[in-house]
């Protein structure tokens, strides 16, 4: 049994780091493998993560962490029984993938303005809470070419757009994702999408 693709890990900078790797053949990850992780800190102990399958030869492990600070560094040991398959380290602050925003809502009752709001996925005491920016993706269910991205570079988790920038009388979907420039993070996963019917009063034309 060998590791084909070494573990790569990302942290949500809150309580979970996710590590993924590939074995050289079909593997029952949860029964055959264990990922041990230990914070490099005085008197810390090793903790065990039981991996799950992620495709035939792929494994994924969700490492539970109490909190994360920039100084943190973890040692990682991948074991198959008594055999050490791989040894490495992981610094969560250098591999951050934010949590996805939630509760995306489209408010359509604001005088021909669409107000999209969502929730910041972090509690106020988390460092990322005040450092997230967002991308909002809006697309038409009827027209695949009608697909747009709005970059929200301010901290407030909301976006206002004129309803008239979208076509009237058809359904749209929106989703939102987040990233943090301060840690040069990757983008989060997209939030679940939300759907609404876009309708607004066309202005009267003067003849």
């Amino acid at each position: 049994m060998k590791v084909l693709q070494e573990p790569t890990c990302v942290s949500d900078y809150m309580s979970i780091s996710t590590c993924e790797w590939k074995m050289n053949g079909p593997t029952n990850c949860s029964t055959e493998l264990r990922l041990l992780y230990q914070l490099v800190f005085l008197l810390s102990e090793a903790h065990t993560c039981i991996p799950e399958n992620n495709g035939g030869a792929g494994c994924v492990c969700h490492l539970l962490m109490d909190d994360v600070v920039s100084a943190d560094n973890y040692t990682l040991d991948l074991w198959a029984g008594q055999q050490l398959l791989w040894k490495g380290s992981f610094k969560p602050s250098e591999h951050v993938k934010p949590r996805a925003p939630g509760n995306l809502t489209v408010h359509t009752n604001v005088s021909d303005t669409l107000l999209l709001t969502w929730s910041n996925p972090y509690p106020p005491d988390n460092y990322l809470y005040n450092h997230l920016t967002y991308a909002v993706n809006i697309w038409s269910e009827n027209d695949p070419a009608d697909f747009r991205i709005y970059n929200v570079t301010y901290l407030e988790p909301s976006l206002r757009i004129a309803a008239s920038t979208l076509k009237s009388g058809i359904s749209y979907r929106a989703r939102v994702r987040a990233w943090a420039q301060c840690y040069n993070t990757t983008w989060s996963e997209w939030s679940p999408s939300t759907k609404w019917h876009n309708s607004y009063r066309e202005p009267f034309e003067q003849h």
């Epitope: 914070l39 810390s44 109490d66 943190d72």
Partner: antibody
Framework: EVQLVESGGGLEQPGGSLRLSCAGS????????MTWVRQAPGKGLEWVSS????????YYADSVKGRFTISRDNSKNTLYLQMNSLRAEDTAVYYC??????????????????WGQGTTVTVSS | DIVMTQSPLSLPVTPGEPASISCRSS???????????LDWYLQKSGQSPQLLIY???NRASGVPDRFSGSGSGTDFTLKISRVEAEDVGFYYC?????????FGQGTKLEIK
């Protein structure tokens, strides 16, 4: 009541050995790191050794490294300090103390919040 | 090793008066989540040390509120707002950020 009781001290000749014990009660012994601190007559406090809750990680002062061994038996709620190749400068009162909670990924520290009554080790010919 | 330096080494105080002990470390004791790994202990004559303050400013269980700790990084202070006769003994600061844990030389508080 949370309590630590040391035993095993005594008079020993230079080059000899002693084994100190520290019995813990009133708390979940295996969840906490433990520490030994000593105090030579008329002197201040000196850290000797620490061990994590499971016993997998141990740390020693340079002055005792290679001569002293810290260990624990969590089934007996007992901490040990095996002292070999004793020297006159090891003469001191030895205290065990309850250290940080090591069950979480990041150990939770509340100080050395419980100390034993101390056991006296005298090394003399 | 981190060197801990206490001052003064001797502190005569009148009962009811305040007292202050300083402790300086040779490197920062600030690590994660804003915690400074600095404790204060009192050792009364013939007794084991007892914890007063942990993580620089947290009073240990059962410690009277006349004791308070402050400071961050390398400079720390233990204050007693009104000294009582039972407060006499040796006061030690200790860092537990890394091994070896190191103690200050001790400050002897005595009643005038």
């Amino acid at each position: 009541e949370v309590q630590l009781v040391e035993s095993g001290g005594g008079l020993e000749q230079p080059g000899g050995s002693l084994r100190l014990s520290c019995a813990g009660s009133g708390f979940t012994f295996r969840d906490y790191a433990m520490t030994w601190v000593r105090q030579a007559p008329g002197k201040g406090l000196e850290w000797v050794s620490s061990i994590s809750g499971s016993g997998s990680n141990t740390y020693y002062a340079d002055s005792v490294k290679g001569r002293f061994t810290i260990s624990r038996d969590n089934s007996k709620n007992t901490l040990y300090l095996q002292m070999n190749s004793l020297r006159a400068e090891d003469t001191a009162v030895y205290y065990c103390a309850k250290d940080r909670l090591t069950t979480a990924v990041r150990p939770s520290y509340y100080g050395l919040d419980v100390w034993g009554q101390g056991t006296t080790v005298t090394v003399s010919s | 090793d981190i060197v801990m330096t206490q001052s003064p080494l001797s502190l005569p105080v009148t009962p009811g008066e305040p007292a202050s002990i300083s402790c300086r470390s040779s490197q920062s004791l600030l690590y994660s989540l804003g915690y400074n790994y600095l404790d204060w202990y009192l050792q009364k004559s013939g007794q084991s040390p007892q914890l007063l303050i942990y993580l620089a400013s947290n009073r240990a269980s059962g410690v009277p509120d006349r004791f308070s700790g402050s400071g961050s990084g390398t400079d720390f202070t233990l204050k007693i707002s009104r000294v009582e006769a039972e407060d006499v003994g040796f006061y030690y600061c200790m860092q537990s950020l890394q091994t070896p844990y190191t103690f200050g030389q001790g400050t002897k508080l005595e009643i005038k």
